[in-house]
């Protein structure tokens, strides 16, 4: 439905508060280095303009597209070239090329200072002094650090952020009330950002078909009682929502997401029995709840898949008539029967089925050719099952920190060219799969683990894409979205790697390590471990473990010393010398 003024349409649909918040998110995701005040000024100007269009849709410039309006506004920033360099060249382009140009310059790892949490009293004072600015600042800081964060979901996070301060700033023990809530929001926020980044990578790098296949599989697992036509409709709508958000069209995305939630709730009887509670909530909570809703129970007495997809004489006829529809039905039928499989496994099975039909439907006896296609699935199913079993056993034996260390060593040996901060971040996140998924029963382990690993490996892929250093990473990241994890799992030690030159500075530590949080101290130790492997890739696990224990003994000793800095200087030299002698660094 065409509107005379798109900006007026979205302003009216979303309301002023959400409109302003979404424009701020959009601008902060595009211009990640701009100061907060500059963004607020731009947002206010856009909002005032939108109001004139609401009053009169025929007013000057009100008929322009949102990309044109927003792009023109971004291009008024005076310091664009000094701050962003070649991104300023985007402003010389016309739409839609200008928006594409801005999208290409989004930085997954912007050079921004770490967010340091102020004292609780300081935060509460700031919250009470100017609640609106305080919450806008939250949106701005998250959006600029996470340029693909799912914008309507960020509004939900901001709502929870506000609720936490409203409640806790009047509590007797403000810190005890607030800090756990902020930790939870931070951890959930990082996870949400990473999940959305995979959706955007899927759409942008592998296309709409890849995303739709993922959505068919996931929604079929979640809504196994829904008809294929219903799932297909939801997939089409969901694809539109995510295409818009990933493309920077945040107003349209939020509006369409609200429409989709409304549709799902109006049609829950034909979708899922698990939606009732979600649908009683306000809009932001409702959308979030639907996105996280548990899988519905599988319908009883589902017939065997083989009848329609192997035994039927019409397989090739049905496939030829509408290939993607037939494959979509296969994926739907398989996924609704297998909530115990990861989405990526289901997609591998569908790909194997497609490849088999492509080959067999051109053969002399197609039925004879594809009769054993389901037998080809067995090794594909067993591979992640075995991997998860082995790694959960290792996790249970080692605990999270040492499990992360084992993965750090494993991945540094696979792709030693990757930067140390990236290897530490990715391996730490890979290691979290243990506490996240290994506690689940067998039926829930694979979907939890392998789909989580897909999200984490995508972080590696997007960070590596910014500064490519390893052909092996590029290959695993670009060849097949669903085979990324098996591709990385299959990598052995990189025998072509020339060990890094020894640099004593890398292994120099100071007394500041003693005042770090446990997490930060772990990161310091893990950074040293990666550097150690880069210097000595042939070191055995036992040697690395022993050197890391020496490192722990050194830190513990010096943190207890009266003159900590002198201890770190003197004992640090001894530690390096000892490690060099033992490992031949």
């Amino acid at each position: 439905d065409a509107h005379k003024s798109e900006v007026a349409h979205r302003f009216k649909d979303l309301g002023e508060e959400n409109f302003k918040a979404l424009v701020l998110i959009a601008f902060a995701q595009y211009l990640q280095q701009c100061p907060f005040e500059d963004h607020v000024k731009l947002v206010n100007e856009v909002t005032e303009f939108a109001k004139t269009c609401v009053a009169d849709e025929s007013a000057e410039n009100c008929d322009k597209s949102l990309h044109t309006l927003f792009g023109d506004k971004l291009c008024t920033v005076a310091t664009l070239r000094e701050t962003y360099g070649e991104m300023a060249d985007c402003c010389a382009k016309q739409e839609p090329e200008r928006n594409e140009c801005f999208l290409q310059h989004k930085d997954d790892n912007p050079n921004l200072p770490r967010l340091v949490r102020p004292e609780v009293d300081v935060m509460c004072t700031a919250f009470h002094d100017n609640e609106e600015t305080f919450l806008k600042k939250y949106l701005y800081e998250i959006a600029r650090r996470h340029p693909y964060f799912y914008a309507p979901e960020l509004l939900f996070f901001a709502k929870r952020y506000k609720a936490a301060f409203t409640e806790c700033c009047q509590a007797a023990d403000k810190a005890a009330c607030l800090l756990p809530k902020l930790d939870e929001l931070r951890d959930e926020g990082k996870a949400s950002s990473a999940k959305q980044r995979l959706k955007c990578a899927s759409l942008q790098k592998f296309g709409e078909r890849a995303f739709k296949a993922w959505a068919v599989a996931r929604l079929s697992q979640r809504f196994p009682k829904a008809e294929f036509a219903e799932v297909s409709k939801l997939v089409t709508d969901l694809t539109k929502v995510h295409t818009e958000c990933c493309h920077g069209d945040l107003l349209e995305c939020a509006d369409d997401r609200a429409d989709l939630a409304k549709y799902i709730c109006e049609n829950q009887d034909s979708i899922s029995s698990k939606l009732k509670e979600c649908c009683e909530k306000p809009l932001l909570e409702k959308s979030h709840c639907i996105a996280e809703v548990e899988n519905d129970e599988m319908p009883a007495d589902l017939p065997s898949l083989a009848a329609d997809f192997v035994e039927s004489k019409d397989v090739c006829k049905n496939y030829a008539e509408a290939k993607d529809v037939f494959l979509g039905m296969f994926l739907y039928e398989y996924a609704r029967r297998h909530p115990d499989y990861s989405v990526v496994l289901l997609l591998r099975l569908a790909k194997t089925y497609e490849t088999t039909l492509e080959k067999c439907c051109a053969a002399a006896d197609p039925h004879e050719c594809y009769a054993k296609v389901f037998d080809e699935f067995k090794p594909l199913v067993e591979e992640p099952q075995n991997l998860i079993k082995q790694n959960c056993e290792l996790f249970e034996q080692l605990g999270e920190y040492k499990f992360q260390n084992a993965l750090l060593v494993r991945y540094t040996k696979k792709v030693p060219q990757v930067s140390t901060p990236t290897l530490v971040e990715v391996s730490r996140n890979l290691g979290k799969v243990g506490s996240k998924c290994c506690k689940h029963p067998e039926a829930k382990r694979m979907p939890c683990a392998e789909d989580y690993l897909s999200v984490v490996l995508n972080q590696l892929c997007v960070l590596h894409e910014k500064t490519p250093v390893s052909d092996r990473v590029t290959k695993c990241c670009t060849e097949s979205l669903v085979n990324r994890r098996p591709c990385f799992s299959a990598l052995e030690v990189d025998e072509t790697y020339v060990p890094k030159e020894f640099n004593a500075e890398t292994f120099t530590f100071h007394a500041d390590i003693c005042t770090l949080s446990e997490k930060e101290r772990q990161i310091k130790k893990q950074t040293a471990l990666v550097e150690l492997v880069k210097h000595k890739p042939k070191a055995t696990k036992e040697q690395l473990k022993a050197v890391m224990d020496d490192f722990a003994a050194f830190v513990e000793k010096c943190c207890k010393a009266d003159d900590k800095e002198t201890c770190f200087a003197e004992e640090g030299k001894k530690l390096v010398a000892a490690s060099q002698a033992a490992l031949g660094l």
Epitope: Q543, A546, D550, A552, E556, A578, A581
Partner: nanobody, 124 residues
């Protein structure tokens, strides 16, 4: 399973020297740090020395620094504690222990396997 057997303890005069040995069998010896601890009557077991897996790094309790020296021979699966300038307050049962997979390097809880101990008595 690891067996650790200490030897070399005895009764000596203040100012004398003793060399304790600890022979290991069972689990890989060379991959782990080893510790020496001691326990005087009515007191907690306390850290004396730690020697790393390769014998290239040693840490000592302040009370024994400069007088005691830990060493190891991985070929013989043995760790040593050379004790010089012994004092009456060094009197205790001395234990060697193999480092565990976690916990403090300076606390008994950070060590998994223990010997039965050897008595050292220093008379004045």
């Amino acid at each position: 399973q690891v067996q650790l057997v200490e030897s070399g303890g005895g009764l000596v005069q203040a100012g004398d020297s003793l060399r304790l040995s600890c022979a290991a069998s069972g689990r890989t010896f060379s991959g782990y740090a080893m510790g020496w601890f001691r326990q005087a009557p009515g007191k907690e077991r306390e850290f004396v020395a730690r020697i790393n897996w390769s014998g290239t790094l040693t840490y000592y309790a302040d009370s024994v620094k400069g007088r005691f020296t830990a060493s190891r021979d991985n070929a013989k699966n043995t760790v040593y504690l050379q004790m010089n300038s012994l004092k009456p307050e060094d009197t205790a049962v001395y234990y060697c222990a193999q480092r565990g997979d976690s916990g403090s390097n300076y606390d008994p809880s950070g060590y998994s396997y223990w010997g039965q101990g050897t008595q050292v008595t220093v008379s004045s």
